[in-house]
Interface confidence: medium
Amino acid sequence: MMTGTIETTGNISAEKGGSIILQCHLSSTTAQVTQVNWEQQDQLLAICNADLGWHISPSFKDRVAPGPGLGLTLQSLTVNDAGEYFCIYHTYPDGTYTGRIFLEVLESSVAEHGARFQIP
């Protein structure tokens, strides 16, 4: 039975040219995390594998940094970076947990963090 929940940074805003941390946290389960996939829409950005460590897609290598923790840091943001991001936690023995983050990239300097929310 899957008892865990994923807490994410929720809906977030950031300025064009700035940077943002995408963060997910898996709680309420003793399952072992074997891998975390980070996706933008259906494009694979990065994986953090328990054995292999971090790998960042070559397309994003200049602007994406691993961490903190199992999170991902996006730098030099452009308007094309706006949209949905998913963290997919592969765990044993529970299976997979998915969290969603929506990023808005603003032209102006009125960027505010949205509230944290939970995805079961």
Partner: antibody, heavy 120, light 108 residues
């Protein structure tokens, strides 16, 4: 263009070891993982494991744990797969393959294959 | 480990036929499903990645569909060079990566 060139066919006795090489060219070697896949005569494809060319970290198929070692030499852009304590059922064609990021880790380029025959 | 079940294991078809091959995963793999073609004595060749994206250089008669657990490879009009064995592979979980058992497409 991207190329993976493997070493030549090998004939080994049961209990011996074999080391197959896979020389990569045409791309940044350390940006991708290399997987090894084998195919016994008349059988399907079996994933053996994967090595990160970035940091040398590995994960191996459970059934081969303890018998297989995968390494890379970044100075020559070469991956190696060593299989020890060979048995007759290890007779197979061994392939190296690059895991493509844009292909969500699908194997976009393959070596030509190395036939390893285990026979007394 | 995620299991992939291909069906049928073999099929006979004629040039010009529409051919469909199924791949079912034992749990959801979202769109992390790839299709390969392998001819005797040759390395596999990536045809479709991410369930429905055509790999560069692959003819448009090949297409893929599905997400979650059920996926299909379709060859709209079978050509003589398409007689081969086709494999699906999941890359959703790399512990381990797994292949389907293969589907052999033979000449009727």
């Amino acid at each position: 263009q991207v190329q993976l060139v493997q070493s030549g066919a090998e004939v080994k006795k049961p209990g011996a070891s074999v080391k197959v090489s896979c020389k990569a060219s045409g791309y940044t070697f350390t940006s991708y993982g290399i997987s090894w896949v084998r195919q016994a005569p008349g059988q399907g494809l079996e994933w053996m494991g994967w090595i990160s060319a970035y940091n040398g970290n590995t994960n191996y198929a459970q059934k081969l744990q303890g018998r297989v070692t995968m390494t890379t030499d970044t100075s020559t852009s070469t991956a190696y797969m060593e299989l020890r304590s060979l048995r007759s059922d290890d007779t197979a064609v061994y392939y190296c393959a690059r895991a493509g990021w844009e292909q969500q880790l699908g194997f976009d380029y393959w070596g030509q294959g190395t036939l390893v025959t285990v026979s007394s | 480990a995620i299991q992939l079940t291909q069906s049928p294991s073999s099929l006979s078809a004629s040039v010009g036929d529409r051919v469909t091959i199924s791949c079912r995963a034992s749990q959801t793999i979202r769109s992390y499903l790839n299709w390969y073609q392998q001819k005797p004595g040759k390395a596999p060749k990536l045809l479709i990645y991410a369930a429905s994206s055509l790999q560069s250089g692959v003819p448009l008669r090949f297409s893929g569909s599905g997400s979650g657990t059920d996926f299909t490879l379709t060859i709209s009009s079978l050509q003589p060079e398409d007689f081969a064995t086709y494999y699906c592979q999941q890359s959703y979980s790399t512990l381990p990566l797994t292949f389907g058992g293969g589907t052999k497409v033979e000449i009727k």
